[in-house]
């Protein structure tokens, strides 16, 4: 049974040109991760396997940096990253958990942070 | 179990054009990117094109952007390549390949198809 | 683009040997590098993932290291059916590039 929950950072801006950390926390199981994948609307971003580390799409490399811990932190914001970032947890043995965030990217200087919330 | 099998090659003309197809069954093929590689007689591998899930996203190498586009049909567990303005540098074997779902690497090919630019 | 640069080209060795490939890639490609296997007239197999992971069912006898710009591919004890046509590859970056190969036949 997959007892776990996933807390993203939820619906964010930002500003282009800017950055921006994407963040999910697993919590409520004991299940190991053994890698999160990162994804952008159908494209894969970034990988973290448990054993071996990151890889960062080739599509991405310039723009994408991991980190800080499983986060990812996307660089040179343009318009066009505006949209769904899905945190996909691989577990065992529980299997696969999913985490989603809106990040809006905006023209303007008043990016605020949106509030965190719960994915079960 | 994993299968890719391409089809569509054949010989034509320089400047001409080629529809190949790749069928993939044994998997959810809808979750897997994918892409073309072909192989020139007696040569190495070319990576040609690769295309994201949905299909939103494609790449290719510049040798052949301009002229060829590679597509999906979900529904229907099929690649495409579609080629166009053929050159005699183009007579290869096609294959199409899945990315892992591990890593960027290209985990299952099928076994190829074979095109032929000659006049 | 980065060139991926294997050596040798050729090699000849025995059933039982221990054989090294090696892959210069001309800039850092970190460790994303694969390693394939081709046979006559058949489709490429994949070996060797992220510089050093087996790909589900092949045998331990291959393994794969390195990162940055120099990676090995070994074969600890060559099996008849090991012989055939090496090829690595970065994913790196886009243009996907794999090297020129490595055929390994029979001494």
């Known amino acids: 049974m997959m007892t776990g929950t996933i807390e993203t950072t939820g619906n964010i801006s930002a500003e282009k040109g800017g950055s921006i950390i994407l963040q999910c926390h697993l919590s409520s199981t004991t299940a190991q991760v053994t890698q999160v994948n990162w994804e952008q609307q159908d494209q894969l971003l970034a990988i973290c396997n448990a054993d071996l580390g990151w890889h960062i799409s080739p599509s991405f490399k310039d723009r994408v940096a991991p980190g800080p811990g499983l986060g990812l932190t996307l660089q040179s914001l343009t318009v066009n990253d505006t949209g769904e970032y899905f945190c996909i947890y691989h577990t065992y043995p529980d299997g696969t958990y999913t985490g989603r965030i809106f990040l809006e990217v905006l023209e303007s200087s008043v990016a605020e942070h949106g509030a965190r919330f719960q994915i079960p | 179990e994993v299968q890719l099998v391409e089809s569509g090659g054949g010989l034509v003309q320089p400047g001409g054009s080629l529809r190949l197809s790749c069928a993939a069954s044994g998997f959810t093929f809808s979750d897997y990117h994918m892409y073309w590689v072909r192989q020139a007689p007696g040569k190495g591998l070319e990576w040609v094109a690769y295309?994201?899930?949905?299909?939103?996203?494609?790449y290719y190498p510049d040798t052949v952007k301009g002229r060829f586009t590679i597509s999906r049909d979900n529904a229907k567990n099929s690649l495409y390549l579609q080629m166009s303005r053929l050159r005699a540098e183009d007579t290869a074997v096609y294959y199409c390949?899945?990315?892992?779902?591990?890593?960027?690497?290209?985990?299952?090919w099928g076994r190829g198809t074979l095109v032929t630019v000659s006049s | 683009d980065i060139q991926m640069t294997q050596s040798p080209s050729f090699l000849s060795a025995s059933v039982g040997d221990r054989v090294t490939i090696t892959c210069k890639a001309s800039?850092?490609?970190?460790?994303?590098v694969a390693w394939y296997q081709q046979k006559p007239g058949k489709a490429p197999k994949l070996l060797i993932y992220?510089?050093?992971a087996r790909h589900t069912g092949v045998p331990s006898r291959f393994s794969g290291s390195g990162s940055g710009t120099d990676f090995t591919l070994t074969i600890s004890s060559l099996q008849p059916e090991d012989f055939a046509t090496y090829y690595c590859q970065q994913y790196s970056s886009y243009p996907l590039t794999f090297g020129q190969g490595t055929k390994l036949e029979i001494k």
């Open positions: 800039q850092d490609v970190g460790t994303s």
């Open positions: 390949a899945r990315q892992s779902s591990y890593d960027f690497a290209m985990d299952y």
């Open positions: 295309i994201s899930k949905g299909g939103i996203s494609t």
């Open positions: 992220w510089a050093s």
